[in-house]
């Protein structure tokens, strides 16, 4: 229904706390360089204005759209051109072009320093002094680094953060209470960020239809007892929520997400038997819980998929009459029977089925042509299954760090033109799939591995889009989202690449490496490994292992030495010589 004042409507629906949090996230995601204080001032002004509209919906400007109100605020920021360059040109446009322009200027890799966590005591002090400001800083810092973070979910993580601080700051040993808990939240939030970015990419590149197909598959796996009409309704609503968030309409997105959660909890009987625990929780926890609820038990009496989609005499008639609906029912029926498949795989199967019908239904004898379609799925299913087996075996053999290194070598060979920091970040993220997925039960491994890899590779594509350097990467990133992972997996050594000159300074280290945290040490070593591969793309695994073992030994020796600096300056050049010889 239409409201006289959109801003008053959203303020009333969301309440002041969530309203302010979402406006802060929106501003931080649009203008990623502004300080917290600048954004906090704008948020307060918007909130004060919203309150005047709540008091009187006919007050001046209360009838304006949220994009107009927010855009006007952002465009009024002083020194916009100096700080943001051509983004300032957006302000010469009218809505809706102005908002589209802001969206196009979101930076997936802003040049901001890593979000450093303060020391426990300091954190607790500032949290106790002003919890609201503390949480505001958290929202601002995460949102500006992750401009597509799912806003209502970021409110959930802020709430988690708040609860952890409340609990741990009351403990004697704050540090040991906070560190593992906050690390856990950080890890989950980073995964949430890449997953959501993938959804927005799907929406931006391929439109609502592509996202809705993803949603149908995912929801059908989770709710196999819900009928097709129910799944379609949920998928349509979920598509709207994600479209709004990806489009920067964060107030509408959060409001509609709350509505969807409410609907699901009011209709558990027709959706799933597993929702009650989630539905007992307060709003943010409820919506989060529903988004990752366990799969319902599959109905026992499901007929073979072939009955309706291969053997039925009316396959081509049904397909021709309502292609999207027929393919949707195929995706629904296949997905509800296969919680053990990844969504990407299910979408590839649906695509194969569609291509088969397009070809066969135009022929003289369609049933003879499409009769073998299910058998033709086999190679498509085997490929990711083999990928999971091979990679999980390797992970179990090497551990996370070793597995990351194996992936780093593999991907540097596939795309040696890509910058070393991007390759290291990608390999570290791809390597985490082992820890995340390989320990799961067999039937959960494939969906976990492939859907996570797809999300990470989406980030690789986004970073590469900014500065395209590798034809291999461009080729894989240009195709459909669901084909990306198989495309990257199939890449081999780039034969067109001219090896990098060997530069001794690339492999020269100093004693400061000794005091770095373990993660930073690993990154330094992985940076060296990527550079080695760029110098010798065809080096064997054995050669690289020899060099890296030598390198590790060198670091260990010099970091234990009484005179570290002397050790690094004398042993370093020897290491470089040995490396060159080993790779000759």
């Amino acid at each position: 229904e239409a409201h006289k004042s959109e801003i008053a409507h959203r303020y009333n629906d969301l309440g002041e706390q969530h309203f302010k949090g979402l406006v802060l996230i929106a501003f931080s995601q649009y203008l990623q360089k502004c300080s917290y204080d600048e954004h906090a001032k704008l948020v307060q002004e918007v909130t004060d204005f919203a309150k005047t509209c709540v008091a009187d919906e006919s007050a001046a400007n209360c009838d304006k759209s949220l994009h107009t109100l927010f855009g006007d605020k952002l465009c009024a920021i002083p020194n916009l051109r100096e700080n943001y360059g051509e983004l300032a040109d957006c302000c010469t446009k009218q809505e809706p072009e102005r908002n589209e322009c802001f969206l196009q200027h979101k930076d997936d890799n802003p040049s901001l320093p890593p979000f450093e966590r303060p020391e426990a005591e300091a954190m607790c002090t500032s949290f106790k002094e002003n919890p609201t400001t503390f949480m505001g800083h958290y929202l601002h810092e995460v949102a500006r680094r992750h401009p597509y973070f799912y806003a209502p979910e970021l409110l959930y993580y802020a709430e988690q953060y708040n609860e952890i601080l409340t609990q741990c700051c009351a403990e004697a040993d704050k540090e040991s209470c906070l560190t593992p808990k906050l690390d856990g939240v950080k890890e989950k939030a980073l995964v949430s960020s890449v997953r959501q970015r993938m959804k927005c990419s799907s929406m931006q590149k391929f439109g609502e239809r592509a996202f809705k197909a993803w949603a149908v598959a995912r929801l059908s796996q989770t709710f196999p007892n819900a009928d097709f009409a129910e799944i379609t309704k949920l998928a349509t609503d979920l598509t709207k929520v994600n479209k709004e968030c990806c489009h920067g309409d964060l107030l509408e997105c959060a409001d509609d997400r709350a509505e969807l959660a409410k609907y699901m909890c009011e209709n558990q009987a027709t959706i799933s038997s597993k929702l009650q625990t989630c539905c007992d929780k307060p709003l943010l926890k409820k919506a989060h819980c529903l988004s990752e609820v366990e799969h319902d038990t599959m109905p026992a009496d499901l007929p073979a998929i072939a009955a309706d989609f291969v053997e039925d005499q009316e396959v081509c008639k049904n397909y021709a009459e309502a292609k999207d609906v027929f393919l949707g029912t195929f995706l629904y029926e296949y997905s509800r029977r296969h919680p053990d498949y990844s969504v990407s795989l299910l979408l590839r199967l649906a695509k194969k089925y569609e291509a088969t019908l397009e070809k066969c239904c135009a022929e003289a004898n369609p049933p003879a042509c499409y009769g073998t379609v299910l058998a033709e799925f086999q190679p498509l299913v085997e490929e990711p299954k083999n990928l999971v087996k091979t990679n999980c075996d390797l992970y179990e053999k090497l551990g996370e760090y070793g597995f990351q290194n194996a992936i780093l070598v593999r991907y540097t060979q596939k795309a040696p033109q890509v910058s070393t920091p991007t390759l290291v970040e990608a390999a570290r993220n791809l390597g985490r799939v082992g820890t995340k997925c390989c320990t799961l039960p067999e039937d959960q491994r494939l969906p976990c591995v492939e859907d996570y890899l797809s999300a990470i590779l989406n980030r690789v594509c986004l970073l590469h889009e900014k500065t395209p350097v590798s034809e291999h990467v461009t080729k894989c990133c240009s195709g459909s989202l669901v084909e990306r992972r198989p495309c990257f997996s199939a890449l081999t050594v780039d034969e067109t690449y001219v090896p990098k000159e060997f530069k001794a300074e690339t492999f020269t280290f100093h004693s400061d490496i000794c005091t770095l945290p373990e993660k930073e040490k690993q990154i330094k070593k992985q940076t060296a490994l990527a550079e080695l591969v760029k110098h010798k793309p065809k080096a064997t695994a054995e050669q690289l292992k020899t060099v890296m073992d030598d390198f590790a030994q060198f670091l260990d020796t010099c970091c234990k030495a009484a005179d570290k600096d002397t050790c690094f300056s004398t042993e370093g050049p020897n290491l470089v010589t040995r490396c060159k010889d080993a790779l000759a």
Epitope: A320, E321, V325, E358
Partner: nanobody, 123 residues
Framework: EVQLVESGGGEVQPGGSLRLSCAAS????????MVWVRQAPGKGLEWVST????????VYAESVKGRFTISRDNAKNTVYLQMNSLRAEDTAVYYC????????????????RGQGTLVTVKP
């Protein structure tokens, strides 16, 4: 709103021909499959033929195969049914139809339909 207007019906002798037309509006015609169904006096709806959105796929009921031809012109938002070698049993009201969101595929009572055009085949 969705509108389907059939025309071209009439009285014809057995063995004769007619060409039915259906002008569509109120929906995205070029992405919609189209259907002809018919209803003989005192009978239920019977499916006759279906054509896909891009006209690549055409399907016919056994009773009309080889005699009827379905076609469409997406530029004119029109679907046609060319009926040759007409028989007495082809006498019916012919409806042009398209899928309605939320209905079951093949459940023609629930599809969007026009008012129909009467085809009478008699000596």
């Amino acid at each position: 709103e969705v509108q389907l207007v059939e025309s071209g019906g009439g009285e014809v002798q057995p063995g004769g021909s007619l060409r039915l037309s259906c002008a569509a509006s109120g929906f995205t015609f070029s992405t919609s499959g189209m259907v002809w169904v018919r209803q003989a006096p005192g009978k239920g709806l019977e499916w006759v033929s279906t054509i896909s959105d891009d006209a690549r796929i055409t399907v016919y009921a056994e009773s009309v195969k080889g005699r009827f031809t379905i076609s469409r012109d997406n530029a004119k938002n029109t679907v046609y049914l060319q009926m040759n070698s007409l028989r007495a049993e082809d006498t019916a009201v012919y409806y042009c139809a398209t899928y309605r969101a939320g209905s079951r595929i093949g459940s023609y009572e629930d599809y969007y339909r026009g008012q129909g055009t009467l085809v009478t085949v008699k000596p």
